[in-house]
Interface confidence: medium
């Protein structure tokens, strides 16, 4: 679960995130994995931690390997993964897939690639583009912040994308690439009866009495833009702002999200402090729009807790 | 300013349970995990455990195991601290404290005082 | 568990004039991280205690220059250089390397 794959080339900067988040004050401890060796602080190592980032300037292939980072709050050590592997650079101009990154899909009217993981490093604009190797050139394209916008975007758009950047480090500059791939999707739309895709119908969630749970609602409503979707909760039959139970909240702002062409809607349902009364309600997740409303009940059961928080046994 | 406002003075029965109150204010509750400290003349300070409000996480000290359960509530800002079976070894004064990354303990309750007496 | 040391009392002193008390630790404090964590606490008579000094040699917000502290990974001295009335009390050094945290049994400054 806390355990990230990361890449990059041969004698270019890689910057990866240690997998487990903590606020920006905790302290981050980096090891080699397999000899539990610590990772030094000091810059003027090729490789060295800081904080929650572990820098390689310049990477080499010798450093592919697990690194462990531990985030150090007051009282909780929680540790992640970074799997990181360091490829040569290959002569010829083909991208292999293992140096993709996500796919993203663009349409006439949406058509920025960002360039990822540019928002670890220390980067000034503007950045290189290229597509299948090749140097963008033309008004078509636009280099705006950390994303290409292309207008009027064709079918023959669709391709391999390259951003190229420099990363600075205390007056040292590094280059860094990254590949993905952009697909061009037609933007007919549609809106369809509301498909709830979670809860399932009379799910049983599990939870433990006196901790936190979250419930998300989840549904598609058709293909583009939609006039009218909506999805939220319901406790008992009535509106959660009507129920009148403060520890019990759902978590404003549905944004729509694209994924797979589809229009989608999400709404979380917080249960801060569950307790025995919870477990007798009926949560019920609504999904409606212009085709009409469907509704997924759910109900809470206790789940046993296992006492797997202490680190101190 | 961060503040610690701790429930009122208890005196209960041996045998019995007793739900201490810790209010923060004046900063976002979940920035900070909530620490329980037991203070007696004999051990003087000793830590019972601590409560992570942000992921529900606990930790204990194995000594106060089974006889402290920590936990808060984010809406009130509140952290609570149930002591159970109790008996005159529990008397004591008990604070809520706050801790940050570097600033272990940083921020105390006023404290507790609970008498178990018959 | 790490066991802090402490002497119940420090050699009473004269109002102006600097005040060491010590702490000793059953293991070292030093984690690789370079950061020794110890941290020593002030409890005024009838109050909460205080937090003086973090990751042992820190001065925490708000508290006068006049306290200082250092030490090795097991043996600490918290210093006060010119003693005021308002520093009376007892001194805790803590350990907050490993659970369960400890602390140490507290010395008390006593004035002459």
């Known amino acids: 679960k806390f355990s990230k794959q990361s890449w990059g080339l041969e004698n270019e900067a890689l910057i990866v995130r240690c997998p487990r988040q903590g606020k920006p004050s905790y302290t981050v401890d980096w090891y080699y994995s397999q000899t539990n060796k610590s990772i030094p602080t000091q810059e003027r190592n090729r490789v060295f931690a800081s904080g929650q980032l572990l820098k390689f300037l310049p990477a080499a292939v010798a450093d592919s390997g697990i690194y462990t980072c531990i985030v150090r709050s007051p009282t909780f050590n929680r540790t992640g993964y970074a799997n990181v592997t360091i490829y040569k650079k290959q002569s010829d101009c083909n991208v292999p897939d293992y140096l993709m990154y996500s796919t993203v899909s663009g349409s006439e009217k949406n058509s920025k690639i960002y360039c990822p993981t540019i928002d670890l490093y220390n980067w000034t604009a503007p950045l290189e583009w290229f597509k299948n190797c090749q140097a963008l050139q033309g008004s078509r394209y636009r280099a705006h912040k950390s994303f290409l916008v292309i207008d009027n975007v064709m079918t023959e758009d669709a391709g391999d994308y390259t951003c190229k950047f420099i990363h600075n480090e205390n007056g040292a500059n590094y280059s860094v690439t990254a590949t993905r791939s952009f697909t061009v999707k037609d933007e007919q739309g549609f809106s369809l009866f509301p498909v709830i895709g979670a809860p399932a119908q009379n799910e049983i969630k599990e939870v433990e009495i006196g901790k936190n749970a979250n419930l998300t609602c989840s549904a598609c409503f058709g293909k583009g833009t939609q006039f009218l979707a909506a999805v939220l909760w319901q406790l008992n039959g009535t509106k959660i702002t009507d129920f009148g139970e403060p520890r019990i909240q759902q978590e404003e702002g549905q944004n729509q999200s694209f994924s797979n062409g589809l229009a989608c809607l999400d709404m979380v349902l917080r249960i801060a402090d569950v307790k025995e009364e919870d477990l007798l309600l009926q949560y019920d997740c609504l999904a409606l729009n212009l085709h009409g409303l469907r509704r997924h009940t759910v109900r809470l059961s206790r789940k046993n807790p296992i006492d797997h928080h202490s680190i101190y046994c | 300013q961060v503040q610690l406002q701790q429930s009122g003075a208890e005196l209960v029965r041996p045998g019995a349970s007793v739900t201490l109150s810790c209010k923060a204010s004046?900063?976002?509750?979940?920035?900070?995990?909530m620490q329980w400290v037991k203070q007696t003349p004999v051990h003087g300070l000793e830590w019972i455990g601590a409560?992570?409000?942000?992921?529900?996480?606990?930790a204990y000290n194995q000594k106060f195991k089974g006889k402290a359960t920590l936990t808060a509530d984010k809406s009130s800002s509140t952290a609570y601290m149930e002591l159970s079976s109790l008996t005159s070894e529990d008397s004591a004064v008990y604070y809520c404290?706050?801790?940050?990354?570097?600033?272990?303990?940083?921020?105390w309750g006023q404290g507790t005082s609970l008498t178990v007496s018959s | 568990d790490v066991v802090m040391t402490q002497t119940a009392f420090s050699n009473p002193v004269t109002l102006g004039t600097s005040a060491s008390i010590s702490c000793r630790s059953s293991?070292?404090?030093?984690?690789?991280?370079?950061?020794?964590?110890l941290y020593w606490y002030l409890q005024k008579p009838g109050q909460s205690p205080q937090l003086l000094i973090y990751?042992?040699?820190n001065l925490a917000s708000g508290v006068p220059d006049r306290f200082s502290s250092s030490g090795s990974g097991t043996d600490f001295t918290l210093r006060i250089s010119r003693v005021e009335a308002e520093d009376v009390g007892v001194y805790y050094c803590?350990?907050?390397?490993?659970?369960?945290?400890?602390f140490g049994s507290g010395t008390k400054l006593e004035i002459k």
């Open positions: 404290s706050g801790s940050t990354t570097d600033y272990y303990f940083a921020y």
């Open positions: 004046g900063h976002i509750f979940t920035d900070y995990e």
């Open positions: 409560f992570d409000p942000e992921t529900g996480d606990t």
């Open positions: 293991k070292s404090l030093l984690h690789s991280n370079g950061i020794i964590y």
């Open positions: 990751q042992m040699s």
């Open positions: 803590a350990q907050n390397l490993e659970l369960p945290f400890t």
